[in-house]
Interface confidence: low
């Protein structure tokens, strides 16, 4: 039975040209995290594998940095980065947990963080 929950940074906004940290946290489970995938609408950004470490998609090597922790840092943001991002936690024995973050990249300096929320 999957008992865990994923807490994410929720709906967030950032300014064009800036950077943002995408962060998920898996709680309420003793399952072992074997791998975390970061994806944007089914496009793989990065993988953090318990055995192999970090792997950044070649297309994003210049703009994506691993961490902090199991999170992901997006740099040199453009308005095209606006959209949904997913953290996919592969765990044993529970299975797969998915968290969703919506990022809005703004042209002007009106960026502010949204409230944190939980995804069951």
């Amino acid at each position: 039975m999957m008992t865990g929950t994923i807490e994410t940074t929720g709906n967030i906004s950032a300014e064009k040209g800036g950077s943002i940290i995408l962060q998920c946290h898996l709680s309420s489970t003793t399952a072992q995290v074997t791998q975390v995938n970061w994806e944007q609408q089914d496009q793989l950004l990065a993988i953090c594998n318990a055995d192999l470490g970090w792997h950044i998609s070649p297309s994003f090597k210049d703009r994506v940095a691993p961490g902090p922790g199991l999170g992901l840092t997006l740099q040199s943001l453009t308005v095209n980065d606006t959209g949904e991002y997913f953290c996919i936690y592969h765990t044993y024995p529970d299975g797969t947990y998915t968290g969703r973050i919506f990022l809005e990249v703004l042209e002007s300096s009106v960026a502010e963080h949204g409230a944190r929320f939980q995804i069951p």
Partner: antibody
Framework: QVKLQESGPGLVKPSQTLSLTCTVT?????????WNWIRQPPGKGLEWIGY???????SYNPSLKSRVTISVDTSKNQFSLKLSSVTAADTAVYSC???????????WGQGTLVTVSA | DIQMTQSPSSLSASVGDRVTIPCKAS??????VAWYQQKPGKAPKLLIY???YRYTGVPSRFSGSGSGTDFTLTISSLQPEDFATYYC????????????????FGEGTKLEIK
């Protein structure tokens, strides 16, 4: 239980447009996931055609992009494929499938054979 | 496009055999590979995702391994119902407007009774 079922003409004339519909039961296609079309020519391997996401975003195989349109009818919980200017090379079993992010194509329809012939 | 090469295209084995089916990618995929089983006239079934994770309900005799460009599906003790065609698939990326790599499948390896 999630089920996908393809429907549409089994025979299409060359240069015409192939139109297929996938009816999904047991899950609302506007809730989550990417909803895909995949084809398999007789005796050959699988080719991904494209998808439409639960939020309406589309993505197509570049080799087919100029001829493909995938759309959704939320009221009927269906998504559709249109492939224009077909030739005999488009003869294949066409299947719809649901992809779960981070996993793969987890649910498939049984597929429907479309033959392109005069 | 990322090419997925499956060789051999067919393989003969007996019930109880240990079988390995290789798949080679044309570029580094990390662990973003899935494996499917397809029987004649039926839809493919997902067996393995992220190179080595068994999908729900898949028997433990099926296992996947590999990272980078070389991947393997292993059936530890072949059962009569395992004779089918097996496809590897890269799930590394999808074609967005600025990123034009489609999901691609290998040509398949048909597992036949010896």
């Amino acid at each position: 239980q999630v089920k996908l079922q393809e429907s549409g003409p089994g025979l299409v004339k060359p240069s015409q447009t192939l139109s297929l519909t996938c009816t999904v039961t047991g899950y609302s296609i506007t809730s989550d996931y990417a909803w895909n079309w995949i084809r398999q020519p007789p005796g050959k391997g699988l080719e991904w055609i494209g998808y439409i996401t639960y939020s309406g975003g589309t993505s197509y195989n570049p080799s087919l992009k100029s001829r493909v349109t995938i759309s959704v009818d939320t009221s009927k919980n269906q998504f559709s494929l249109k492939l224009s200017s077909v030739t005999a090379a488009d003869t294949a079993v066409y299947s719809c499938a649901r992809r779960q992010i981070g996993l793969g194509f987890t649910y498939w329809g049984q597929g429907t054979l479309v033959t392109v012939s005069a | 496009d990322i090419q997925m090469t499956q060789s051999p295209s067919s393989l003969s084995a007996s019930v109880g055999d240990r079988v390995t089916i290789p798949c080679k990618a044309s570029q580094d995929l990390s662990t973003a590979v899935a494996w499917y089983q397809q029987k004649p006239g039926k839809a493919p079934k997902l067996l393995i995702y992220s190179s080595s994770y068994r999908y729900t309900g898949v028997p433990s005799r099926f296992s996947g391994s590999g990272s980078g460009t070389d991947f393997t599906l292993t059936i530890s003790s072949l059962q009569p119902e395992d004779f089918a065609t097996y496809y590897c698939q890269q799930s590394y990326s999808t074609p967005q407007q600025h990123y034009s790599t489609p999901w691609t499948f290998g040509e398949g390896t048909k597992l036949e009774i010896k």
